[in-house]
Interface confidence: low
Protein backbone atom coordinates (compact mmCIF):
# COMPACT_ATOMS: atom_id res chain seq x y z
CA UNK A 1 0.00 0.00 0.00
CA UNK A 2 1.31 3.47 -0.96
CA UNK A 3 -0.16 6.73 0.32
CA UNK A 4 0.71 10.07 -1.28
CA UNK A 5 2.61 12.63 0.77
CA UNK A 6 4.04 15.87 -0.65
CA UNK A 7 5.38 16.68 -4.10
CA UNK A 8 8.34 18.76 -5.29
CA UNK A 9 9.49 20.19 -8.61
CA UNK A 10 12.88 18.96 -9.78
CA UNK A 11 15.36 19.02 -12.65
CA UNK A 12 16.91 15.57 -13.21
CA UNK A 13 20.35 15.16 -14.79
CA UNK A 14 22.54 12.18 -15.59
CA UNK A 15 26.14 12.04 -14.40
CA UNK A 16 27.26 13.65 -17.67
CA UNK A 17 25.18 16.68 -16.63
CA UNK A 18 22.66 16.14 -19.43
CA UNK A 19 19.14 17.29 -18.54
CA UNK A 20 16.15 14.96 -18.66
CA UNK A 21 13.23 16.35 -20.69
CA UNK A 22 10.12 15.16 -22.50
CA UNK A 23 10.30 15.64 -26.25
CA UNK A 24 7.34 16.39 -28.55
CA UNK A 25 6.71 12.66 -28.91
CA UNK A 26 6.42 12.31 -25.11
CA UNK A 27 9.74 10.44 -24.95
CA UNK A 28 12.04 10.95 -21.94
CA UNK A 29 15.46 11.96 -23.31
CA UNK A 30 18.66 13.52 -22.00
CA UNK A 31 20.30 16.46 -23.71
CA UNK A 32 23.09 18.95 -23.06
CA UNK A 33 21.47 22.19 -21.92
CA UNK A 34 22.64 25.42 -20.39
CA UNK A 35 20.68 26.70 -17.38
CA UNK A 36 18.88 29.13 -19.67
CA UNK A 37 18.08 26.30 -22.14
CA UNK A 38 16.69 24.35 -19.21
CA UNK A 39 14.47 27.29 -18.21
CA UNK A 40 13.41 27.95 -21.82
CA UNK A 41 12.37 24.31 -22.23
CA UNK A 42 10.23 24.30 -19.09
CA UNK A 43 7.85 22.67 -18.29
CA UNK A 44 9.35 19.82 -20.33
CA UNK A 45 12.44 19.87 -18.10
CA UNK A 46 10.61 20.18 -14.79
CA UNK A 47 9.50 16.97 -13.12
CA UNK A 48 7.04 16.55 -10.32
CA UNK A 49 8.44 14.05 -7.83
CA UNK A 50 5.63 12.90 -5.56
CA UNK A 51 6.59 11.07 -2.40
CA UNK A 52 4.58 8.22 -0.93
CA UNK A 53 4.55 6.48 2.39
CA UNK A 54 5.07 2.77 1.99
CA UNK A 55 3.41 0.16 4.18
CA UNK A 56 6.60 -1.93 3.76
CA UNK A 57 9.44 0.62 4.12
CA UNK A 58 11.90 -0.05 1.31
CA UNK A 59 13.32 3.41 0.65
CA UNK A 60 11.52 6.61 -0.37
CA UNK A 61 8.70 5.64 -2.73
CA UNK A 62 8.12 8.21 -5.49
CA UNK A 63 6.34 8.82 -8.76
CA UNK A 64 7.83 11.03 -11.47
CA UNK A 65 5.42 13.18 -13.47
CA UNK A 66 5.52 16.07 -15.90
CA UNK A 67 2.87 18.66 -16.71
CA UNK A 68 2.79 19.88 -20.28
CA UNK A 69 -0.76 20.21 -21.58
CA UNK A 70 -1.82 17.44 -19.23
CA UNK A 71 -0.05 15.54 -16.43
CA UNK A 72 1.81 12.41 -17.49
CA UNK A 73 3.43 9.95 -15.07
CA UNK A 74 6.44 7.76 -15.69
CA UNK A 75 5.67 4.06 -15.99
CA UNK A 76 7.86 0.98 -16.45
CA UNK A 77 5.08 -1.38 -17.53
CA UNK A 78 6.61 -4.53 -19.06
CA UNK A 79 10.04 -3.01 -18.32
CA UNK A 80 9.43 -0.35 -20.98
CA UNK A 81 9.74 3.28 -19.91
CA UNK A 82 6.96 5.60 -21.05
CA UNK A 83 4.91 8.52 -19.78
CA UNK A 84 1.26 7.69 -19.33
CA UNK A 85 -1.39 10.39 -19.25
CA UNK A 86 -2.44 10.21 -15.60
CA UNK A 87 -2.16 12.07 -12.33
CA UNK A 88 -0.11 10.44 -9.58
CA UNK A 89 -2.84 8.73 -7.54
CA UNK A 90 -3.44 9.53 -3.87
CA UNK A 91 -3.36 5.85 -2.93
CA UNK A 92 -2.10 2.65 -4.51
CA UNK A 93 -3.52 -0.47 -2.89
CA UNK A 94 -0.65 -2.78 -3.77
CA UNK A 95 2.94 -3.45 -2.72
CA UNK A 96 4.18 -2.96 -6.31
CA UNK A 97 3.31 -0.52 -9.02
CA UNK A 98 4.65 0.30 -12.47
CA UNK A 99 4.68 4.01 -11.55
CA UNK A 100 6.34 3.71 -8.12
CA UNK A 101 10.11 3.85 -7.84
CA UNK A 102 12.28 3.68 -4.74
CA UNK A 103 14.52 6.71 -4.66
CA UNK A 104 17.77 6.26 -2.73
CA UNK A 105 20.56 8.76 -2.35
CA UNK A 106 24.30 8.20 -2.36
CA UNK A 107 25.75 8.64 1.16
CA UNK A 108 27.07 12.15 1.70
CA UNK A 109 25.44 13.30 -1.56
CA UNK A 110 21.76 13.87 -0.95
CA UNK A 111 21.18 15.13 -4.51
CA UNK A 112 22.65 12.02 -6.19
CA UNK A 113 19.94 9.43 -6.65
CA UNK A 114 19.06 6.08 -8.07
CA UNK A 115 15.50 4.96 -8.78
CA UNK A 116 14.62 1.28 -8.43
CA UNK A 117 11.37 -0.05 -9.86
CA UNK A 118 8.92 -1.32 -7.26
CA UNK A 119 7.52 -3.73 -9.86
CA UNK A 120 10.84 -5.17 -11.02
CA UNK A 121 13.29 -5.60 -8.19
CA UNK A 122 16.88 -4.98 -9.24
CA UNK A 123 15.82 -2.84 -12.23
CA UNK A 124 16.74 0.84 -12.20
CA UNK A 125 16.09 3.94 -14.24
CA UNK A 126 19.16 4.48 -16.40
CA UNK A 127 20.46 6.62 -19.22
CA UNK A 128 21.41 4.73 -22.38
CA UNK A 129 22.72 6.04 -25.68
CA UNK A 130 20.87 4.74 -28.73
CA UNK A 131 22.21 6.11 -32.02
CA UNK A 132 22.23 9.89 -31.42
CA UNK A 133 19.72 9.87 -28.58
CA UNK A 134 20.28 9.53 -24.86
CA UNK A 135 17.20 7.71 -23.59
CA UNK A 136 15.74 7.03 -20.16
CA UNK A 137 15.37 3.26 -19.87
CA UNK A 138 14.80 0.58 -17.25
CA UNK A 139 17.94 -1.46 -16.76
CA UNK A 140 18.84 -4.47 -14.68
CA UNK A 141 21.78 -3.53 -12.49
CA UNK A 142 24.31 -6.29 -12.87
CA UNK A 143 27.64 -4.56 -12.58
CA UNK A 144 29.31 -2.58 -9.84
CA UNK A 145 30.11 1.08 -10.42
CA UNK A 146 27.42 1.56 -13.07
CA UNK A 147 27.24 5.32 -13.67
CA UNK A 148 24.21 5.04 -15.92
CA UNK A 149 21.80 4.43 -13.02
CA UNK A 150 22.86 7.51 -11.04
CA UNK A 151 21.21 10.91 -11.39
CA UNK A 152 21.35 14.30 -9.77
CA UNK A 153 18.06 15.77 -8.63
CA UNK A 154 17.92 19.53 -8.21
CA UNK A 155 14.89 20.90 -6.42
CA UNK A 156 13.32 23.88 -8.14
CA UNK A 157 10.72 24.95 -5.58
Amino acid sequence: YFGKLESKLSVIRNLNDQVLFIDQGNRPLFEDMTDSDCRDNAPRTIFIISMYKDSQPRGMAVTISVKCEKISTLSCENKIISFKEMNPPDNIKDTKSDIIFFQRSVPGHDNKMQFESSSYEGYFLACEKERDLFKLILKKEDELGDRSIMFTVQNED
Epitope: L15, Q56, R58, R104, V106, P107, G108, H109, K112, Q114, E116, E121, G122, F124, E141, E143, L144, G145, D146, R147, I149, M150
Partner: antibody, heavy 120, light 107 residues
Amino acid sequence: QVQLVQSGAEVKKPGSSVKVSCKASGGTFSTFSISWVRQAPGQGLEWMGGIIPIFGTANYAQKFQGRVTITADESTSTAYMELSSLRSEDTAVYYCARGGYGGYYYFDYWGQGTLVTVSS
Amino acid sequence: DIQMTQSPSSLSASVGDRVTITCRASQSISNRLNWYQQKPGKAPKLLIYKGSTLQSGVPSRFSGSGSGTDFTLTISSLQPEDFATYYCQQHYQWLTTFGQGTKVEIK
Protein backbone atom coordinates in the same frame (compact mmCIF):
# COMPACT_ATOMS: atom_id res chain seq x y z
CA GLN B 1 42.98 -7.82 -13.23
CA VAL B 2 42.04 -5.43 -10.42
CA GLN B 3 44.50 -5.20 -7.55
CA LEU B 4 44.35 -3.25 -4.30
CA VAL B 5 47.74 -2.83 -2.64
CA GLN B 6 47.88 -1.48 0.90
CA SER B 7 50.68 0.20 2.82
CA GLY B 8 52.75 -1.73 5.36
CA ALA B 9 52.22 -2.61 9.02
CA GLU B 10 52.28 0.16 11.61
CA VAL B 11 53.01 0.30 15.34
CA LYS B 12 51.46 3.32 17.05
CA LYS B 13 51.21 4.82 20.54
CA PRO B 14 47.82 5.35 22.21
CA GLY B 15 46.41 8.79 21.39
CA SER B 16 48.27 9.05 18.08
CA SER B 17 46.92 8.68 14.50
CA VAL B 18 47.56 6.24 11.69
CA LYS B 19 47.05 6.71 7.95
CA VAL B 20 46.77 3.62 5.74
CA SER B 21 46.83 3.80 1.94
CA CYS B 22 45.22 1.57 -0.69
CA LYS B 23 46.41 1.86 -4.30
CA ALA B 24 44.16 0.46 -7.02
CA SER B 25 45.34 -0.77 -10.39
CA GLY B 26 43.90 -2.70 -13.32
CA GLY B 27 40.47 -1.15 -13.36
CA THR B 28 38.42 2.05 -13.12
CA PHE B 29 39.00 3.74 -9.78
CA SER B 30 36.62 6.70 -9.75
CA THR B 31 33.30 5.02 -10.40
CA PHE B 32 33.53 2.42 -7.67
CA SER B 33 33.39 2.82 -3.92
CA ILE B 34 36.32 2.01 -1.69
CA SER B 35 35.37 0.84 1.79
CA TRP B 36 37.51 0.18 4.82
CA VAL B 37 36.80 -2.91 6.91
CA ARG B 38 38.72 -3.84 10.03
CA GLN B 39 39.21 -7.09 11.90
CA ALA B 40 40.51 -7.20 15.47
CA PRO B 41 42.50 -10.32 16.45
CA GLY B 42 40.16 -13.32 16.56
CA GLN B 43 37.13 -11.14 15.82
CA GLY B 44 34.75 -10.60 12.91
CA LEU B 45 34.60 -8.02 10.12
CA GLU B 46 33.59 -4.45 10.93
CA TRP B 47 32.76 -1.88 8.24
CA MET B 48 34.23 1.54 9.06
CA GLY B 49 33.16 3.65 6.12
CA GLY B 50 33.64 4.25 2.44
CA ILE B 51 34.15 6.78 -0.31
CA ILE B 52 33.16 7.07 -3.97
CA PRO B 53 36.09 8.90 -5.55
CA ILE B 54 33.99 10.46 -8.33
CA PHE B 55 31.74 12.08 -5.72
CA GLY B 56 34.42 12.89 -3.14
CA THR B 57 32.60 12.78 0.18
CA ALA B 58 32.93 9.77 2.47
CA ASN B 59 30.37 8.22 4.78
CA TYR B 60 31.17 6.50 8.04
CA ALA B 61 29.77 3.94 10.44
CA GLN B 62 28.35 5.67 13.52
CA LYS B 63 30.93 4.02 15.77
CA PHE B 64 33.83 5.70 13.96
CA GLN B 65 32.22 9.06 13.20
CA GLY B 66 34.57 11.89 14.16
CA ARG B 67 37.60 9.63 14.53
CA VAL B 68 38.05 8.30 11.01
CA THR B 69 38.70 10.22 7.79
CA ILE B 70 38.55 8.49 4.41
CA THR B 71 39.88 10.30 1.36
CA ALA B 72 40.74 9.44 -2.23
CA ASP B 73 43.19 10.82 -4.77
CA GLU B 74 41.87 10.15 -8.27
CA SER B 75 45.15 11.15 -9.91
CA THR B 76 47.02 8.30 -8.22
CA SER B 77 44.05 5.91 -7.83
CA THR B 78 44.75 5.77 -4.10
CA ALA B 79 42.36 5.77 -1.15
CA TYR B 80 43.39 6.63 2.40
CA MET B 81 41.99 5.86 5.82
CA GLU B 82 43.17 7.91 8.80
CA LEU B 83 42.15 6.88 12.32
CA SER B 84 42.88 9.26 15.17
CA SER B 85 42.93 9.07 18.99
CA LEU B 86 44.13 5.48 18.79
CA ARG B 87 43.53 3.10 21.67
CA SER B 88 44.58 -0.49 22.27
CA GLU B 89 41.18 -1.74 21.01
CA ASP B 90 42.07 -0.33 17.58
CA THR B 91 44.73 -3.01 17.16
CA ALA B 92 43.46 -4.82 14.07
CA VAL B 93 44.04 -5.68 10.46
CA TYR B 94 42.59 -2.95 8.25
CA TYR B 95 41.37 -3.91 4.79
CA CYS B 96 40.32 -1.77 1.86
CA ALA B 97 37.71 -3.28 -0.46
CA ARG B 98 36.16 -2.25 -3.76
CA GLY B 99 32.40 -2.04 -3.95
CA GLY B 100 29.63 -0.45 -5.99
CA TYR B 101 27.30 2.43 -5.30
CA GLY B 102 24.16 1.30 -7.03
CA GLY B 103 21.48 -0.90 -5.53
CA TYR B 104 24.00 -3.65 -4.93
CA TYR B 105 26.93 -3.06 -2.66
CA TYR B 106 29.27 -6.01 -2.48
CA PHE B 107 33.05 -6.16 -2.17
CA ASP B 108 34.56 -8.04 -5.10
CA TYR B 109 38.22 -7.10 -4.57
CA TRP B 110 40.11 -6.68 -1.30
CA GLY B 111 43.51 -5.37 -0.31
CA GLN B 112 45.96 -7.68 1.45
CA GLY B 113 45.36 -5.99 4.81
CA THR B 114 47.46 -3.71 7.00
CA LEU B 115 48.16 -4.67 10.60
CA VAL B 116 47.99 -1.69 12.95
CA THR B 117 49.26 -2.36 16.46
CA VAL B 118 48.48 0.18 19.18
CA SER B 119 50.76 -0.26 22.15
CA SER B 120 52.48 1.93 24.71
CA ASP C 1 21.20 -0.16 12.01
CA ILE C 2 20.25 -3.55 10.64
CA GLN C 3 21.68 -6.40 12.74
CA MET C 4 22.81 -9.65 11.15
CA THR C 5 22.75 -12.86 13.18
CA GLN C 6 24.58 -15.90 11.87
CA SER C 7 24.15 -19.44 13.11
CA PRO C 8 25.81 -21.56 14.13
CA SER C 9 28.87 -19.61 15.29
CA SER C 10 30.95 -22.71 14.61
CA LEU C 11 30.44 -26.22 13.28
CA SER C 12 32.46 -29.38 12.75
CA ALA C 13 32.02 -31.34 9.55
CA SER C 14 33.74 -33.95 7.42
CA VAL C 15 34.87 -33.82 3.81
CA GLY C 16 31.88 -34.64 1.60
CA ASP C 17 29.30 -33.36 4.11
CA ARG C 18 26.52 -30.97 3.14
CA VAL C 19 26.91 -27.82 5.23
CA THR C 20 24.29 -25.13 5.81
CA ILE C 21 24.89 -21.73 7.43
CA THR C 22 22.04 -19.34 8.12
CA CYS C 23 21.92 -15.59 8.44
CA ARG C 24 18.98 -13.63 9.82
CA ALA C 25 18.45 -9.89 9.37
CA SER C 26 16.71 -7.77 12.01
CA GLN C 27 14.44 -6.38 9.26
CA SER C 28 13.64 -7.25 5.66
CA ILE C 29 16.59 -6.64 3.32
CA SER C 30 15.07 -8.06 0.11
CA ASN C 31 17.94 -9.93 -1.60
CA ARG C 32 20.65 -7.46 -0.55
CA LEU C 33 22.85 -10.09 1.06
CA ASN C 34 26.38 -11.27 0.28
CA TRP C 35 28.50 -14.17 1.56
CA TYR C 36 32.27 -14.16 2.05
CA GLN C 37 34.83 -16.83 2.90
CA GLN C 38 37.91 -16.00 4.95
CA LYS C 39 40.91 -18.15 5.68
CA PRO C 40 43.39 -17.36 8.51
CA GLY C 41 45.73 -14.50 7.64
CA LYS C 42 43.95 -13.78 4.34
CA ALA C 43 41.49 -11.17 3.13
CA PRO C 44 37.86 -12.21 2.76
CA LYS C 45 36.75 -13.55 -0.63
CA LEU C 46 33.36 -12.87 -2.19
CA LEU C 47 31.36 -16.07 -2.78
CA ILE C 48 27.75 -15.03 -3.34
CA TYR C 49 26.09 -11.66 -3.98
CA LYS C 50 22.46 -10.54 -4.37
CA GLY C 51 21.49 -13.45 -2.13
CA SER C 52 22.04 -16.20 -4.68
CA THR C 53 24.38 -15.07 -7.48
CA LEU C 54 27.63 -17.01 -7.58
CA GLN C 55 30.70 -14.81 -7.98
CA SER C 56 32.81 -15.64 -11.03
CA GLY C 57 35.39 -18.38 -10.31
CA VAL C 58 33.60 -19.72 -7.21
CA PRO C 59 32.88 -23.49 -7.34
CA SER C 60 29.27 -24.47 -7.96
CA ARG C 61 29.13 -26.48 -4.71
CA PHE C 62 28.47 -23.09 -3.04
CA SER C 63 24.94 -21.76 -3.28
CA GLY C 64 22.91 -19.05 -1.59
CA SER C 65 19.18 -18.75 -1.07
CA GLY C 66 16.66 -16.67 0.80
CA SER C 67 15.00 -13.28 0.67
CA GLY C 68 13.57 -10.88 3.20
CA THR C 69 15.05 -11.75 6.58
CA ASP C 70 16.27 -15.35 6.31
CA PHE C 71 19.19 -16.48 4.17
CA THR C 72 21.19 -19.66 3.75
CA LEU C 73 24.64 -20.50 2.45
CA THR C 74 24.97 -24.14 1.43
CA ILE C 75 28.11 -26.10 0.59
CA SER C 76 26.79 -29.21 -1.13
CA SER C 77 29.88 -31.36 -0.62
CA LEU C 78 32.51 -29.97 1.71
CA GLN C 79 36.07 -29.99 0.33
CA PRO C 80 39.33 -29.71 2.33
CA GLU C 81 39.87 -26.14 1.07
CA ASP C 82 36.44 -25.07 2.37
CA PHE C 83 37.46 -25.14 6.03
CA ALA C 84 37.31 -21.44 6.81
CA THR C 85 35.14 -18.74 8.41
CA TYR C 86 32.08 -17.52 6.52
CA TYR C 87 30.46 -14.09 6.88
CA CYS C 88 27.18 -12.69 5.62
CA GLN C 89 26.85 -8.98 4.83
CA GLN C 90 23.73 -6.89 4.33
CA HIS C 91 23.73 -3.81 2.17
CA TYR C 92 20.08 -2.85 2.18
CA GLN C 93 21.23 0.28 3.91
CA TRP C 94 24.30 2.16 2.73
CA LEU C 95 25.75 1.57 6.19
CA THR C 96 26.53 -2.07 5.53
CA THR C 97 26.93 -4.61 8.35
CA PHE C 98 28.39 -8.11 8.64
CA GLY C 99 27.26 -11.15 10.57
CA GLN C 100 29.55 -12.33 13.37
CA GLY C 101 30.89 -15.23 11.30
CA THR C 102 30.61 -19.03 11.22
CA LYS C 103 33.77 -21.10 11.59
CA VAL C 104 33.70 -24.40 9.71
CA GLU C 105 36.17 -26.84 11.27
CA ILE C 106 37.27 -30.39 10.48
CA LYS C 107 35.49 -33.07 12.50
